[in-house]
Interface confidence: medium
C-alpha cells in the first residue's frame, strides 16, 4: 500500500455473520473523503461510503482481495489487503447485568444475566468470567469462570455466590464478560469488555450492628465476622479469645475465625468494643445429625409401634436449632415428627405410630434434620414379629383346690391374632424355684388366665409371670410377685410312731413325730390314738398339738396302736405299729464308733423282715425308758447313717436296732457307741493296798462312764524313785531312764504288784487311763518301801 | 446398592479356627438382626446362628453350640462368625443374611473347607 | 427341635403347569413359615413370609398357605425362571434348635 493510502485493515465480528471492519484514513485526509470499498468474491462487490468502516457479510472460508479506494479533494489512493478468517476476532458484545442481588441472611449474592443467544445462530460455548470486588477500593475477591451453550435464542443465566463475609460488611461489586468458543471459527477469539458494575450495598439499621446475627455453623469451618459501626472499634473478641482486626471501609472492621471450635449449647459469643459501646452476636459451631444409629421398630400392644434410636454423635445444637426428627411409613405413606428442645447425650430418643389396619409390614425411615444438614436410616419391619409385651399387671392368684390355682393378669393390647409364651417362676420359701412355660392364645380384651396344677397344699408360694410371642423378640419385665398359701388338704401320710414300755412294764408309751409339712398339707390340729386288739378297739381322747406322745395301760396281749393326724380338712391314714415284742435271747451288746457327724450302722439282709428297721437311740445316762428318736429304714436296706444335731462328741449313746415282721418288733442288735471318742476327763482313783520291802499292791476303781467320754481301752502305770516337795524330777518329766512304765490292756484288772523295789525308799506312782480318743489326766502319790527286816 | 458380601472363607485344618465377615451397605445395619446360614456341598440349608441389631440375644443351633460365635461391629457395618475347633462336618458354604426371622437379603457366600 | 418335612425331594414339570410343594412342621407353628427359592451357584431369596404373605417385588404366581403344621407353596403358572430348588423355613423359635429348614424340593424341566 501506498503511503497515504487506507492502511490498518481490522475485522471483527460478534456474531460470526456480520464482519465489521474498519481501517486507518491515509493521513493528511479530511471529513469528506469518501471510500469505495470492493470484495473480490464470485461476483465482485462494492460499496461507496464515508466512513472507515464497512459491514459486510462474514466471508466463508478461502482468501479474498478487498480494495479500498479512497476518493479526497486532493486525488485519490487504492490499497488492497487479502482478507481471511484467520485474520478476523471474534470479541462478544459487551455483556450486561439483568441483576444482581442479595440475600443477606445467608450472604449469597444472585447474579442474572442474559446471553443474547439470538444474535448467535451457531451453536457455541461460552466461557464467563465474573469478577466480584469489595470495598471502596474494589479489592478483587472472587474471580470465576461459568460455562454456558448459546443455542440460537435468549437465554438467562443465574449464578450464586456465598460470601466467606457477610454482605452487610461492605459494600460488594461484581461485573461479567464473555469469551465465545466456536469450534468452526478459524479467527482469533477475544473476551469481550467488562460488563458495567454493579454494587450491593447493606443500608444500615439502628439495631444490627454485628453480622452474621445467630449463624449456625459446621465445626471446623472458618467464618468472617464484622461490625458496621460509626465509632472507631478498639477490640474483638471470641468467647475470650481476641482477634485481629480487619479494616473494611469507614470505621468498619472484621475478624477471621479459621477451624471453629465446637460450641456450648448456649453457643458462643463474639463481641466488638468501641470506647462507648460493645456490639455482638452469637455463633453456634456444631454438626449435622449423625445417622441414627440402632433404629429399632417394636410395639408393645400391637396398636401402637415404638421407634427407638440412638441419635449418634451429639450435634451440639440445641433448642430452635436441635435436630428434628420425622418418621415416614413409605408404604401408607403416613408420617410422625419429632422436634427436640434439647439433644441429651446419648439418650435413647423415641417416636409412637398408630398401627394400621391390616398392615404387619412397615418400612420406615426416620430422616434427621438440623440446620447444618440431614441424615436417615430405614428399616423393615413386620411388627407381628416385634412385641415386647408390656409388664403383666393385676397379677392374681385364686385357689382352684389344695394343689391347682388359677393366674390371671392384664396384658394391655389387641393380640387376638397372636399366642404367648409366658413364664411362671414358682417359689417355695427354703426351695428351689421353678420354672413353668405356657403357651396361651392372644386376646383382644387384655385379661389372660391360667390354671396352675401340681402344687403343694398349705404351701406358701411367690409366683410372678413375664410373657413373651411365641415367635420371641423380648421377654416383657416381670410382674409384681404375688405370695400365695394354698388350701389346706387332708395330711396324707399317717405319722412316724414308736413305742416303748415303761420301766415297770405296766403302761405303753406311744411317741410319734410331728408330720413333716408336705405331709401335713395343713396345720395339724390333734391327733388320735386308738388301740386295738382282737376283742375291742379303745380310743383315747383327741390329743392336741404339739403333743406328741401318750400312754396306754396294757396288758402283755398283742395290741395294735393306730395313730392319726387331723387337720382342718381332714385326717391322716392312721399309722399302725403293733406293741408285741418278739424275744431275742442271743443278744451281745455291741461298740461302735462313729465318723464325728453321725454312726454307720450295718446289718445283715434278713428275708423275715418285711415290714421295716427301726434304729432309736439314747443318751446311756438317761433313765428308762430309753428314747432320745427313732428312725424307720425299709426291709431291704442293711445300713444307715444315723445322724443329729443333738449328738455330741464323748458322750455315750446306746443303739438298738428292731426288726419288724407280723407285725411285731424284735430286738435285732443293741449296742453302745461314741459319735466321736475323747480322752478320759479324769484319772482313775487308785490305793495302795500293801507295801513290803520290796513291792507295793495298788488298786484303782472304774471312771464313771459319763468321764471316761471314749471306750477304755487300758492304763498307763508309772512308776519312779522319787520324793514329794522335792527338786527331784517328777516321773512323768521326760529324759528319766529310770521311769518304769507298765501298759494295763486288761481293762478288767483291778490291781497291780509292783515288785523288785529297794527297801526304806520313796517311790513316785501315776496312773493314767486311755480310749482311742487320747490319754486322760494323771493321778499321782508317794509311797515308801518297808525296811528290809 | 443394598447388599451384602461375606469373606474369610478357605482351606482348614480340622481342629483350627477360622473368622468369617460380612460387610453391609446400602441399609441401616444397625437396626437389622443378622444370621449365618450354611449349605453343605449338594445339601440343603442350615441355620447356624443368629444376633439381634444391637447385639442383646444370640442363638446357636445345638451343632455348633460351644465352637462358634456370633458378633456384630455395627459401627463398621460387619458381622463376624468365629468358628473355633472346626470338624470336617462345618465344610460349607458360608451366608449371611439379614432380619431376625425372615432372612430377605443373602450374600454371595464364602466357601470353608475343612480338610486335614 | 422343630423339624419341617418338605415333598416332594424332586418335582418334574412343564412350563404353563401348576405346582405344588408342602411341608410339615414336628409341631404348630402358628403362620410362622417362609418360602425360598434357590439356583445353582446362588443365594436363596426370599418369595413369603407369613405362610402366605407375598414378599415386595415377588411375581403374583407363587403363593403360599396353611397354618399349625401343614402348609403348601404354589407356582400357578411354572415359568422358566422358576426352575430352582424351593425351601421352607420356621421361625416360630429360637429355642431350643433354632430357625429350621425343610430338605427342599428341586423343580426340574419334565
Known amino acids: 500500500q501506498k503511503k497515504g493510502a487506507p492502511h490498518d485493515l481490522k475485522c471483527v465480528t460478534n456474531n460470526l455473520q456480520v464482519w465489521n471492519c474498519s481501517w486507518k484514513a491515509p493521513s493528511g485526509t479530511g471529513r469528506g473523503t469518501d471510500y469505495e470499498v470492493c470484495i473480490e468474491n464470485r461476483s465482485r462487490s462494492c460499496y461507496q461510503l464515508e466512513k472507515t468502516s464497512i459491514k459486510i457479510p462474514a466471508l466463508s472460508h478461502g482468501d479474498y482481495e478487498i480494495t479500498i479506494n479512497s476518493l479526497h479533494d486532493f486525488g485519490s489512493s487504492t490499497s488492497k489487503f487479502t482478507l481471511n478468517e484467520q485474520n478476523v476476532s471474534l470479541i462478544p458484545d459487551t455483556p450486561e447485568i439483568l441483576n444482581l442481588s442479595a440475600d443477606f441472611s445467608t450472604s449469597t449474592l444472585y447474579l442474572k444475566w442474559n446471553d443474547r443467544g439470538s444474535v448467535f445462530p451457531h451453536r457455541s460455548n461460552v466461557i464467563w468470567e465474573i469478577k466480584v470486588l469489595r470495598k471502596e477500593s474494589m479489592e478483587l475477591v472472587k474471580l470465576v469462570t461459568h460455562n454456558t451453550t448459546l443455542n440460537g435464542k435468549d437465554t438467562l443465566h443465574h449464578w450464586s455466590w456465598a460470601s466467606d463475609m457477610p454482605l452487610e460488611c461492605a459494600i460488594h461489586f461484581v461485573e461479567i464478560r464473555c469469551y465465545i468458543d466456536n469450534l468452526h471459527f478459524s479467527g482469533l477469539e477475544e473476551w469481550s469488555d467488562w460488563s458495567p458494575v454493579k454494587n450491593i450495598s447493606w443500608i444500615p439499621d439502628s439495631q444490627t450492628k454485628v453480622f452474621p446475627q445467630d449463624k449456625v455453623i459446621l465445626v471446623g469451618s472458618d467464618i468472617t465476622f464484622c461490625c458496621v459501626s460509626q465509632e472507631k472499634v478498639l477490640s474483638a473478641l471470641i468467647g475470650h479469645t481476641n482477634c485481629p482486626l480487619i479494616h473494611l471501609d469507614g470505621e468498619n472492621v472484621a475478624i477471621k475465625i479459621r477451624n471453629i471450635s465446637v460450641s456450648a449449647s448456649s453457643g458462643t459469643n463474639v463481641v466488638f468494643t468501641t470506647e462507648d459501646n460493645i456490639f455482638g452476636t452469637v455463633i453456634f459451631a456444631g454438626y449435622p445429625p449423625d445417622t441414627p444409629q440402632q433404629l429399632n421398630c417394636e410395639t408393645h400392644d400391637l396398636k401402637e409401634i415404638i421407634c427407638s434410636w440412638n441419635p449418634g454423635r451429639v450435634t451440639a445444637l440445641v433448642g430452635p436449632r436441635a435436630t428434628s426428627y420425622t418418621l415416614v411409613e413409605s408404604f401408607s405413606g403416613k408420617y410422625v415428627r419429632l422436634k427436640r428442645a434439647e439433644a441429651p447425650t446419648n439418650e435413647s430418643y423415641q417416636l409412637l405410630f398408630q398401627m394400621l389396619p391390616n398392615q404387619e409390614i412397615y418400612n420406615f425411615t426416620l430422616n434427621a434434620h438440623n440446620p447444618l444438614g440431614r441424615s436417615q436410616s430405614t428399616i423393615l419391619v413386620n411388627i407381628t414379629e416385634k412385641v415386647y409385651p408390656h409388664t403383666p399387671t393385676s397379677f392374681k392368684v385364686k385357689d382352684i383346690n389344695s394343689t391347682a390355682v388359677k393366674l390371671s393378669w392384664h396384658l394391655p393390647g389387641n393380640f387376638a391374632k397372636i399366642n404367648f409364651l409366658c413364664e411362671i417362676e414358682i417359689k417355695k420359701s427354703n426351695s428351689v424355684q421353678e420354672q413353668r412355660n405356657v403357651t396361651i392364645k392372644g386376646v383382644e380384651n387384655s385379661s389372660y388366665l391360667v390354671a396352675l396344677d401340681k402344687l403343694n397344699p398349705y404351701t406358701l408360694y411367690t409366683f410372678r409371670i413375664r410373657c413373651s410371642t411365641e415367635t420371641f423378640w423380648k421377654w416383657s419385665k416381670w410382674s409384681n410377685k404375688k405370695q400365695h398359701l394354698t388350701t389346706e388338704a387332708s395330711p396324707s401320710k399317717g405319722p412316724d410312731t414308736w413305742r416303748e414300755w415303761s420301766s415297770d412294764g405296766k403302761n405303753l408309751i406311744i411317741y410319734w413325730k410331728p408330720l413333716p409339712i408336705n405331709e401335713a398339707n395343713g396345720k395339724i390340729l390333734s391327733y388320735n390314738v386308738s388301740c386295738s386288739s382282737d376283742e375291742e378297739t379303745q380310743s383315747l381322747s383327741e390329743i392336741p398339738d404339739p403333743q406328741h406322745k401318750a400312754e396306754i395301760r396294757l396288758d402283755k396281749n398283742d395290741y395294735i396302736i393306730s395313730v392319726v393326724a387331723k387337720n382342718s380338712v381332714g385326717s391322716s391314714p392312721p399309722s399302725k405299729i403293733a406293741s408285741m415284742e418278739i424275744p431275742n435271747d442271743d443278744l451281745k451288746i455291741e461298740q461302735v464308733v462313729g465318723m464325728g457327724k453321725g454312726i454307720l450302722l450295718t446289718w445283715h439282709y434278713d428275708p423275715n423282715m418285711t415290714c421295716d428297721y427301726v434304729i432309736k437311740w439314747c443318751n446311756s445316762s438317761r433313765s428308762e425308758p430309753c428314747l432320745m428318736d427313732w428312725r424307720k429304714v425299709p426291709s431291704n436296706s442293711t445300713e444307715t447313717v444315723i445322724e443329729s444335731d443333738e449328738f455330741r462328741p464323748g458322750i455315750r449313746y446306746n443303739f438298738f436296732l428292731y426288726g419288724c415282721r407280723n407285725q411285731g418288733y424284735q430286738l435285732l442288735r443293741s449296742m453302745i457307741g461314741y459319735i466321736e471318742e475323747l480322752a478320759p476327763i479324769v484319772a482313775p482313783n487308785f490305793t495302795v493296798e500293801d507295801t513290803s520291802a520290796d513291792s507295793i499292791l495298788v488298786k484303782w476303781e472304774d471312771i464313771p462312764v459319763e468321764e471316761l467320754r471314749g471306750f477304755l481301752r487300758g492304763y498307763l502305770f508309772y512308776f519312779g524313785k522319787g520324793e514329794r516337795d522335792t527338786s527331784k524330777m517328777r516321773v512323768l518329766e521326760s529324759g528319766r531312764s529310770d521311769i518304769k512304765v507298765k501298759n494295763i490292756t486288761d481293762i478288767s484288772q483291778k490291781t497291780l504288784r509292783i515288785a523288785d523295789l529297794q527297801g526304806k525308799t520313796s517311790y513316785h506312782l501315776v496312773l493314767r487311763a486311755y480310749t482311742d480318743g487320747g490319754v486322760g489326766p494323771e493321778k499321782s502319790m508317794y509311797v515308801v518301801t518297808k525296811e528290809n527286816s | 446398592q443394598v447388599q451384602l458380601v461375606e469373606s474369610g472363607g478357605g482351606v482348614v485344618q480340622p481342629g483350627r479356627s477360622l473368622r468369617l465377615s460380612c460387610v453391609a451397605s446400602?441399609?441401616?445395619?444397625?437396626?437389622?438382626?443378622m444370621n449365618w446360614v450354611r449349605q453343605a456341598p449338594g445339601k440343603g440349608l442350615d441355620w447356624v446362628t443368629v444376633?439381634?441389631?444391637?447385639?442383646?440375644?444370640?442363638y446357636y443351633a445345638d451343632s455348633v453350640k460351644g465352637r462358634f460365635t456370633i458378633s456384630r461391629d455395627n459401627s463398621k457395618n460387619t458381622l463376624y462368625l468365629q468358628m473355633n475347633s472346626l470338624r470336617a462336618e462345618d465344610t460349607a458354604m458360608y451366608y449371611c443374611?439379614?432380619?431376625?426371622?425372615?432372612?430377605?437379603?443373602w450374600g454371595q457366600g464364602t466357601l470353608v473347607t475343612v480338610s486335614s | 427341635d422343630i423339624q419341617m418335612t418338605q415333598s416332594p425331594s424332586t418335582l418334574s414339570a412343564s412350563v404353563g403347569d401348576r405346582v405344588t410343594i408342602t411341608c410339615r412342621a414336628s409341631?404348630?407353628?402358628?403362620?410362622?413359615l417362609a418360602w425360598y427359592q434357590q439356583k445353582p451357584g446362588k443365594a436363596p431369596k426370599l418369595l413369603i413370609y407369613?405362610?402366605?404373605s407375598l414378599e415386595s417385588g415377588v411375581p403374583s404366581r407363587f403363593s403360599g398357605s396353611g397354618s399349625g403344621t401343614e402348609f403348601s407353596f404354589t407356582i400357578s403358572s411354572l415359568q422358566p425362571d422358576d426352575f430352582a430348588t424351593y425351601y421352607c423355613?420356621?421361625?416360630?423359635?429360637?429355642?431350643?434348635?433354632?430357625?429350621?429348614f425343610g430338605g427342599g424340593t428341586k423343580v426340574e424341566i419334565k
Open positions: 444376633i439381634w441389631f444391637d447385639g442383646s440375644n444370640k
Open positions: 409341631q404348630s407353628i402358628s403362620s410362622w
Open positions: 446400602g441399609f441401616t445395619f444397625s437396626s437389622y438382626g
Open positions: 423355613q420356621q421361625y416360630k423359635s429360637f429355642s431350643p434348635g433354632g430357625l429350621t
Open positions: 443374611a439379614r432380619g431376625e426371622r425372615t432372612l430377605d437379603l
Open positions: 407369613k405362610a402366605s
